[in-house]
Interface confidence: medium
């Protein structure tokens, strides 16, 4: 049985240019995380595997750093970067846990961050 | 040392069955999806079917679809190919390989890194 | 017939540099999916030679190189060895199909 959850940083806005950190928390299980996947739709933009490290995603090199942690920074923020984004966690013995995170990246210099929210 | 050694191929009558297994070993199997491909006598190289690290989602080639299926077992380490209503055109040597990631959400994009020998079906 | 297209035969001679061709379509090679490369000598486990379109494998020679095009990738091997005689396969995954698709195979043959 599925016991865990993940907690996201929710709906979060940044500025055009900037940086943003996307993050996700899995709590209330003691399944072993294999590896966690960022993916923006259907793209995939990093994996982090126990066994080999952090892979970014050769298309997404240059505008994506690992961390902090299992979370991932996207740098140089365009409008396009706007909308979903998904950290998939595998697990062992539980299977997979997916949160999720919606970016908007403004114009205008007013971005406020949303609050943090769990998904079962 | 990473390695996979696969068993069970022989030779069978058309129409009847085998089961192929896997063995891991050397790196965290429950980490990381596996495939089965064949390559038939004279031919190149065929992907026959995937699994992903917790066995959740299966993949199939058409040519196999309702006649092989592929399971693990991750308390033994072990990848299996069940081969029924075998046919003369699935003749072939049989690997597994080990994929670079998990398989859920991205069995689509990462290759196989680590292959075994192979074992010999002959379907006459 | 392969989904991907390779030319079944290439050969060389020690030390030059030799490309082989992998054709397919917007379904696989032109997709946002990645290209891989694997090297087989006949009796043998097939290897990894270049994963995501251009990336090698550590222990793989920097004499191996890959690149993508549009619906099309080549494998590059430059300063031939004797012990590069092989066939190598491209590989890619085909969301038509929703498999993995592989070429035909190129038996490389070094003079």
């Known amino acids: 049985m599925m016991t865990g959850t993940i907690e996201t940083t929710g709906n979060i806005s940044a500025e055009k240019g900037g940086s943003i950190i996307l993050q996700c928390h899995l709590s209330s299980t003691t399944a072993q995380v294999t590896q966690v996947n960022w993916e923006q739709q259907d793209q995939l933009l990093a994996i982090c595997n126990a066994d080999l490290g952090w892979h970014i995603s050769p298309s997404f090199k240059d505008r994506v750093a690992p961390g902090p942690g299992l979370g991932l920074t996207l740098q140089s923020l365009t409008v396009n970067d706007t909308g979903e984004y998904f950290c998939i966690y595998h697990t062992y013995p539980d299977g997979t846990y997916t949160g999720r995170i919606f970016l908007e990246v403004l114009e205008s210099s007013v971005a406020e961050h949303g609050a943090r929210f769990q998904i079962p | 040392e990473v390695q996979l050694l696969e068993s069970g191929g022989g030779l069978v009558q058309p129409g009847g069955s085998l089961r192929l297994s896997c063995a891991a070993s050397?790196?965290?199997?429950?980490?990381?999806?596996m495939s089965w491909v064949r390559q038939a006598p004279g031919k190149g190289l065929e992907w026959v079917a995937g699994i992903s690290y917790i066995g959740s989602d299966k993949y199939y080639a058409d040519s196999v679809k309702g006649r092989l299926t592929i399971s693990r077992d991750n308390s033994k380490n072990t990848l299996y190919l069940q081969m029924d209503s075998l046919r003369a055109e699935d003749t072939a040597v049989y690997y597994c390989?080990?994929?670079?990631?998990?398989?859920?959400?991205?069995?689509?994009?990462?290759?196989?890194?680590?292959w075994g020998q192979g074992t010999t079906v002959t379907v006459s | 017939q392969s989904v991907l297209t390779q030319p079944p035969s290439a050969s060389g001679t020690p030390g030059q540099r030799v490309t082989i061709s992998c054709s397919g379509s917007?379904?696989?090679?032109?997709?946002?999916?990645?290209v891989h490369w694997y090297q087989h000598l006949p009796g043998t486990a097939p290897k990894l030679l270049i994963y995501?379109?251009?990336q090698r494998p550590s222990g793989v020679p920097d004499r191996f190189s890959a690149s993508k095009s549009g619906t099309s990738a080549s494998l590059a091997i430059s300063g031939l060895q004797s012990e590069d005689e092989a066939d190598y396969y491209c590989s890619a995954w085909d969301d038509s199909l929703s498999a993995w698709v592989f070429g035909g195979g190129t038996k490389l043959t070094v003079l």
């Open positions: 917007t379904s696989n090679i032109g997709t946002s999916r990645y």
């Open positions: 050397g790196f965290t199997f429950t980490t990381y999806a």
């Open positions: 995501l379109d251009s």
């Open positions: 390989a080990k994929h670079l990631t998990g398989g859920t959400t991205d069995y689509y994009y990462y290759g196989m890194d680590v």
